[in-house]
């Protein structure tokens, strides 16, 4: 008795049902449930990065609904009381406690689908989500440490003689900034109350044969490179060009 093991080869799937918002899921179809039933005793807690403003679908252990007695979803979000949603198959009852976010719902009727959906993922949805399935053979669970990803706004400018500033504003988690060529750099991080981080890298190049510098911003939501021509004129500012 324990947690259910997902298919290790399963990749994030983009749903075709909602064209307005990208949707990601770690859930299995009925065929995969049958194939993976032998693995249900294995332990699983999945760390799952999800882009802000997308839809996310979280799924229960791969246990056939006919074997089900009760499903509960425990949702633990930072700074909020724990929310629990429950469904009892025999009486077709649903109950919940401390659940105020209307964007977190059952995908459909729990008797047809035990999955949980988050519509338009926000920073506040960062947290731990756990499905517990009560069956005659014991209780099985699957947990998700949901990490909401926020794409940083990237800017690059020259602020004084042969010095450039690259900023990755309000990203989550913090972006990583690197330069080509390498210069004499100082990096600062500013943490915001909503969990985002602004990274500011200021670099200076003494070598005069360096005329163009590139700021490369690495982030879980994708990478971005900007370049700028260094002008020797003091105080001149030059806008960055995007590759």
């Amino acid at each position: 008795e324990g947690a259910a093991q997902p298919n290790n080869s399963l990749m994030l799937q983009t749903s075709k049902e909602n064209h307005a918002l990208a949707s990601s899921s770690l859930c299995m179809d009925e065929k995969q449930i049958t194939q993976n039933y032998s693995k249900v005793l294995a332990e699983v807690n999945t760390s799952w990065p999800v882009k802000m403003a997308t839809n996310a679908v979280l799924c229960c252990p791969p246990i056939a609904l006919r074997n089900l007695i009760i499903i509960t979803w425990e949702i633990i979000l930072r700074g909020q009381p724990s929310c629990t949603k429950a469904y009892k198959k025999e009486t077709n009852e649903t109950k919940e406690t401390n659940c105020t976010d209307e964007r977190i719902t059952w995908v459909s009727r729990p008797d047809q689908n035990s999955d949980l959906q988050i519509r338009t993922v926000a920073i506040t949805h960062d947290g731990y989500y756990r499905c517990i399935m009560v069956t005659p053979d014991g209780n099985f669970h699957r947990g998700y440490h949901l990490q909401v990803l926020v794409t940083p706004e990237v800017t690059l400018f020259q602020n004084r003689n042969r010095t450039a500033v690259c900023k990755a504003v309000a990203g989550k988690p913090a972006a990583h900034i690197s330069w080509i060529p390498e210069g004499d750099c100082a990096t600062k991080q500013e943490y915001w109350s909503n969990g985002t981080v602004t990274v500011k890298s200021t670099c200076h190049w003494e070598v005069h044969n360096v005329s163009t510098v590139t700021c490369h911003v690495s982030h879980l939501t994708g990478n971005k490179s900007l370049y700028i021509e260094l002008l020797p004129v003091p105080g001149a500012k030059k806008s960055a060009k995007l590759y």
């Epitope: 008795e1 009760i70 509960t72 425990e74 724990s82 629990t84 429950a86 009852e93 009560v134 669970h141």
Partner: antibody, heavy 121, light 110 residues
Framework: EVQLLESGGGLVQPGGSLRLSCAAS????????MSWVRQAPGKGLEWVSS????????YYADSVKGRFTISRDNSKNTLYLQMNSLRAEDTAVYYC??????????????WGQGTLVTVSS | QSVLTQPPSASGTPGQRVTISCTGS????????VSWYQQLPGTAPKLLIY???HRPSGVPDRFSGSKSGTSASLAISGLRSEDEADYYC???????????FGGGTKLTVL
């Protein structure tokens, strides 16, 4: 085999404190709601408190509210009951019980053997 | 006084059928499931019936539960000497926001 083993009971003076523990084995502790139920000598059963699998939802009987605190450590498979400001009427055998109904449809399918708490001067 | 009302005692002879009643209100039995527990002398309680009428594995089918409105009943058929025990009904009470037990019924097998 499911086992629940209570400990921490004993004799305590009125106004004193005691911490009960319940060590669970034979099942995935973190997947179940858990409860404390007590029974005064020669009397019936009285529900004391319940806690959800993750510890986020807690309920208390009015008779212990503000004095008793239920908690759990899922990494240690242990349920706790911190009892403060104890009164003579808290004297009872305290049972730890498992709730497969997850507090939404509560019932107690496995019970420990109990630990006796005596509050007396 | 208990929220759920049970007769303090019941008795029967071996082989007989005995019924124990449990009366509550709309906030407990009327809207929530009933469980029954057996407590043999000097031991911890044991789950006998859950969800009004379901038996856990290992409980003999001589034990059966039923519910109607705000009352529940436990029936024991083919009474045996080893059935001599205290029997408790229990249910969640939505008004009290807590679990409530009946006062218990002491069953004597004559």
């Amino acid at each position: 085999e499911v086992q629940l083993l209570e400990s921490g009971g004993g004799l305590v003076q009125p106004g004193g404190s005691l911490r009960l523990s319940c060590a669970a084995s034979g099942f995935t502790f973190s997947n179940y709601a858990m409860s404390w139920v007590r029974q005064a000598p020669g009397k019936g059963l009285e529900w004391v408190s319940s806690i959800s699998p993750g510890g986020g939802s807690i309920y208390y009987a009015d008779s212990v509210k503000g004095r008793f605190t239920i908690s759990r450590d899922n990494s240690k498979n242990t349920l706790y009951l911190q009892m403060n400001s104890l009164r003579a009427e808290d004297t009872a055998v305290y049972y730890c019980a498992r709730d497969p109904g997850q507090m939404f449809w509560p019932l107690f399918d496995y019970w420990g053997q109990g630990t006796l708490v005596t509050v007396s001067s | 006084q208990s929220v759920l009302t049970q007769p303090p005692s019941a008795s029967g002879t071996p082989g007989q059928r005995v019924t124990i009643s449990c009366t509550g209100s709309s906030s407990n039995i009327g809207s929530n499931n009933v469980s029954w527990y057996q407590q043999l002398p000097g031991t911890a309680p044991k789950l006998l019936i859950y969800d009004d009428s379901h038996r856990p594995s290992g409980v003999p089918d001589r034990f059966s539960g039923s519910k109607s409105g705000t009352s529940a009943s436990l029936a024991i058929s083919g009474l045996r000497s080893e059935d001599e025990a205290d029997y408790y009904c229990g249910s969640w009470d939505a008004s009290l926001n807590g679990y409530v037990f009946g006062g218990g019924t002491k069953l004597t097998v004559l």
